[in-house]
Interface confidence: medium
Amino acid sequence: MGLPTVPGLLLSLVLLALLMGIHPSGVTGLVPSLGDREKRDSLCPQGKYVHSKNNSICCTKCHKGTYLVSDCPSPGRDTVCRECEKGTFTASQNYLRQCLSCKTCRKEMSQVEISPCQADKDTVCGCKENQFQRYLSETHFQCVDCSPCFNGTVTIPCKETQNTVCNCHAGFFLRESECVPCSHCKKNEECMKLCLPPPLANVTNPQDSGTAVLLPLVILLGLCLLSFIFISLMCRYPRWRPEVYSIICRDPVPVKEEKAGKPLTPAPSPAFSPTSGFNPTLGFSTPGFSSPVSSTPISPIFGPSNWHFMPPVSEVVPTQGADPLLYESLCSVPAPTSVQKWEDSAHPQRPDNADLAILYAVVDGVPPARWKEFMRFMGLSEHEIERLEMQNGRCLREAQYSMLEAWRRRTPRHEDTLEVVGLVLSKMNLAGCLENILEALRNPAPSSTTRLPR
């Protein structure tokens, strides 16, 4: 039997309605009708399109290999898509009402099928071995035999779309990738230059060959010298960049338990046993949980003070058939060992306490209804967002932190987190949220420290 979590759902919808009322910009897709389809779609975040009948709704596009059957019934609901029939395909995210027809390889052009048509990609046509594609138009090509370079040597081998490049022997010149005897060269033709007697054609500056060898050597030595100076300085002054120092100077860096640089949030946070360093005094209140054990609703409540912990699992044994979520820490602080991994790893972008505070302030400051859009703007792919959301399926806040942390890990260290976040929020017309984030960082609430993993 499905165990419903209705209060959580109702609350979500109420909050969504509030967001609509207070902040029309706070909900994606509340836009006036525009005739031009492309203009309308630009009003939705990447990977979404404007509902065909209700331009206040943004629906998720269909995955490649599928086509649109019906628009999403409401925001947050999935679009109904169907897989392309045999002989048809869609190669990218789309909202096409039907799939595209697969192309057939043209035998009369000597084409062969490299890979058959699949639901998510068109037929790939190519040429046999030792043939290349000679394009007759932008899309049509003919397969032609590669030149064997008789009376010459191969400079560049035959490629997919390019014939062999030949270097002709003396007494031959190149014409359409073939080495032709100079006797075929007529006066006033380009080949005259190539078919001149050797003494005239082959006058080179004796210095040239020496320069050609010496110059690269000089450059190489210079680079080696610079690298040596750089490494010496790094090892002498490790304060400059501890990360680089530890990598170059081979300073032993202890790495505990797991691979270095794993996400800070435990995957996906098992409930803490008394030994795991869980401090009961850190627990927040637990709204949304009532005494009946069998099908207690889960209520995801927003607001920094409402993220809460459950008692360690070892203290409560679930009765059979009970909702497992009852016995799970819905949003648990990552165990101290997880943070240890960060601190001990040679990860070039481990977040310091200031960074952690910023990430948590961002998590609390961006409206949940706009979170995914925010992460897309930050550069996370739809697939990555979805994976992290599923992986932290019981806790929105943990999922959000994981996403931000994934973004931070692949962002150059010199890029200021707040600056990037500020730019993105401004782009999303959420400058007010940025102010709230800055305010929260200026005046951290006494409880906020408990939210930071130690």
């Epitope: 499905g2 165990l3 947050g76 999935d78 109904v80 898509c81 209804a369 399926g393 929105l396």
Partner: nanobody, 120 residues
């Protein structure tokens, strides 16, 4: 009424295989992403794998990547989890979970679970 009914659990030796099924009813199955989540004895919940509504994108936890395969048959309203090369640490109650239609909570319905025991 939304119902999710898991089956296919049982006792299996390490290295063995099992196929779990989750029969869904009471909602438009093909419109929602689905996930498998497990709870080992005395431990917390661990998300195992997820699949999008059309069955085109699949997601796995690192601990099961390469061993487990999630799939779905929308015509039969059924979610599957093929588990190969099973290990003792895969012993758990496996739940299938439906993706929420509201913001922001990812799952809004869970099944009652099916017990998988990996032991020699």
């Amino acid at each position: 009424e939304v119902q999710l009914l898991e089956s296919g659990g049982g006792l299996v030796q390490p290295g063995g295989s099992l196929r779990l099924s989750c029969a869904a009813s009471g909602f438009t199955f093909g419109s929602y992403s689905m996930s498998w989540v497990r709870q080992a004895p005395g431990k917390g919940l661990e998300w195992v794998s997820g699949i999008d509504n059309g069955g085109h994108s699949t997601y796995y936890a690192d601990s099961v990547k390469g061993r487990f395969t999630i799939s779905r048959d929308n015509s039969k309203n059924t979610l599957y989890l093929q588990m190969n090369s099973l290990r003792a640490e895969d012993t758990a109650v496996y739940y299938c979970a439906k993706r929420s239609s509201g913001l922001p909570f990812p799952f809004d319905y869970w099944g009652q679970g099916t017990l998988v025991t990996v032991s020699s």
